[in-house]
């Protein structure tokens, strides 16, 4: 495939990445699948600058990101290292709270109304953000 040189229609370009901001809500797994079908992934926040950019676009609305601990340790969906990477949790988060009675913890991370992160029940129908890198090889065949 060819390298993507500009963002798809209705996506926003920022620092060599393209972002798409939903205006409806889905459970985390459905949002993750939606982004994958768009040849993208749920947003991976790697810097304070990117955090501010995303926060500006989503406003004070609970919004899923590509961070989860459904298999144990916290993981970014694109493989970015969690331990050494950027973090912006609310105080005392993540707490992986089990009190909701679903038999598992709170395994999915989202932006809260002030932009800081919280872990929550993955079933909540929050909005979401997809991200894809401009330098990434596109799945589309090259133009002849």
């Amino acid at each position: 495939g060819s390298e993507r040189t500009c963002c798809p229609v209705n996506w926003v370009e920022h620092e060599r990445s393209c972002y798409w901001f939903s205006r409806s809500g889905k459970a985390w797994a459905d949002a993750d699948n939606y982004c994958r079908l768009e040849d993208a992934h749920l947003v991976v926040v790697t810097s304070w600058e990117e955090q501010k950019f995303v926060q500006h676009h989503i406003g004070p609305v609970n919004t899923w990101m590509g961070l989860h601990d459904q298999n144990g340790p916290w993981k970014w969906v694109d493989g970015t290292d969690y331990e050494t990477g950027f973090k912006n949790w609310r105080p005392e988060q993540p707490d992986d709270w089990y009190g909701h009675g679903l038999g598992g913890g709170e395994d999915c991370a989202h932006f809260t109304d002030d932009g800081r992160w919280n872990d929550d029940v993955c079933q909540r129908p929050y909005r979401w953000v997809c991200e894809t890198e401009l330098d990434k090889a596109s799945q589309e065949p090259p133009l002849l």
Epitope: A27, L102, T112, N118, Q123, Y126
Partner: antibody, heavy 125, light 107 residues
Framework: QVQLEQSGAEVKKPGASVKVSCKAS????????INWVRQATGQGLEWLGW????????GYAQKFQGRVTMTRNTSISTAHMELSSLRSEDTAVYYC??????????????????WGQGTTVTVSS | DIQMSQSPSSLSASVGDRVTITCRAS??????LGWYQQKPGKAPKRLIC???RLQSGVPSRFSGSGSGTEFTLTISSLQPEDFAIYYC?????????FGPGTKVDIK
């Protein structure tokens, strides 16, 4: 038994604010969301939003964003809903209802199983 | 926002009748739907979750079905205590939205 006890009726003037409380008993307060739903006389039900008492995070219906604030005091198992800039159209019975996700096999659903008795809010000049 | 509609808006029936109420969503909501019963001056009472799951303590004459955009609540044999208003509620997306209600009264 599980109960949600709401505060008494309120009469407010247009432009004022009202704060309705909802005291939980008979269960672990922080294990369920508190939802707020209202019903104008002779009308249907309208959802205002939810709050997770464990940490206080909230989700409000866009229609009420900026006018509604949901808070809690976990030490007394009480949730509060404050609505500001009141207008006559806000005259309604306001209900709190506990809710949480439940699982059946691999399917999750949201269950609002216990409701308060309702608080009548009248907005009139 | 997801819009919910109900039909009929009201119906008159007799004790022992089979009653069916339909709820439609403006977009697919899978099974993310509940049914609530409300009597005058009282808070709503939930009957059914996940479109068809009967809640404990609710009589078996109540049943729910449907998926996607069309759902039904059926009362197999109407009892005197069933005369009330019935609402559907979608929890597929925020804001949660209720149908406008169906009033079931005595013929």
């Amino acid at each position: 038994q599980v109960q949600l006890e709401q505060s008494g009726a309120e009469v407010k003037k247009p432009g004022a604010s009202v704060k309705v409380s909802c005291k939980a008993s008979g269960y672990t307060f922080t294990s369920y969301d508190i939802n707020w739903v209202r019903q104008a006389t002779g009308q249907g039900l309208e959802w205002l939003g939810w709050m997770n008492p464990k940490r206080g995070n909230t989700g409000y219906a866009q229609k009420f964003q900026g006018r509604v604030t949901m808070t809690r005091n976990t030490s007394i198992s009480t949730a509060h809903m404050e609505l500001s800039s009141l207008r006559s159209e806000d005259t309604a019975v306001y209900y709190c209802a506990r809710g949480r996700y439940s699982r059946e096999d691999y399917y999750y659903y949201y269950d609002m199983d216990v409701w308060g008795q309702g608080t009548t809010v009248t907005v009139s000049s | 926002d997801i819009q919910m509609s109900q039909s009929p808006s009201s119906l008159s029936a007799s004790v022992g009748d089979r009653v069916t109420i339909t709820c439609r969503a403006s977009q697919g909501i899978r099974n993310d739907l509940g049914w609530y019963q409300q009597k005058p001056g009282k808070a709503p009472k939930r009957l059914i979750c996940a479109a068809s799951r009967l809640q404990s303590g609710v009589p078996s004459r109540f049943s729910g079905s449907g998926s996607g955009t069309e759902f039904t609540l059926t009362i197999s044999s109407l009892q005197p205590e069933d005369f009330a208003i019935y609402y559907c509620l979608q929890h597929h997306d925020y804001p949660f939205t209720f149908g406008p209600g169906t009033k079931v009264d005595i013929k």
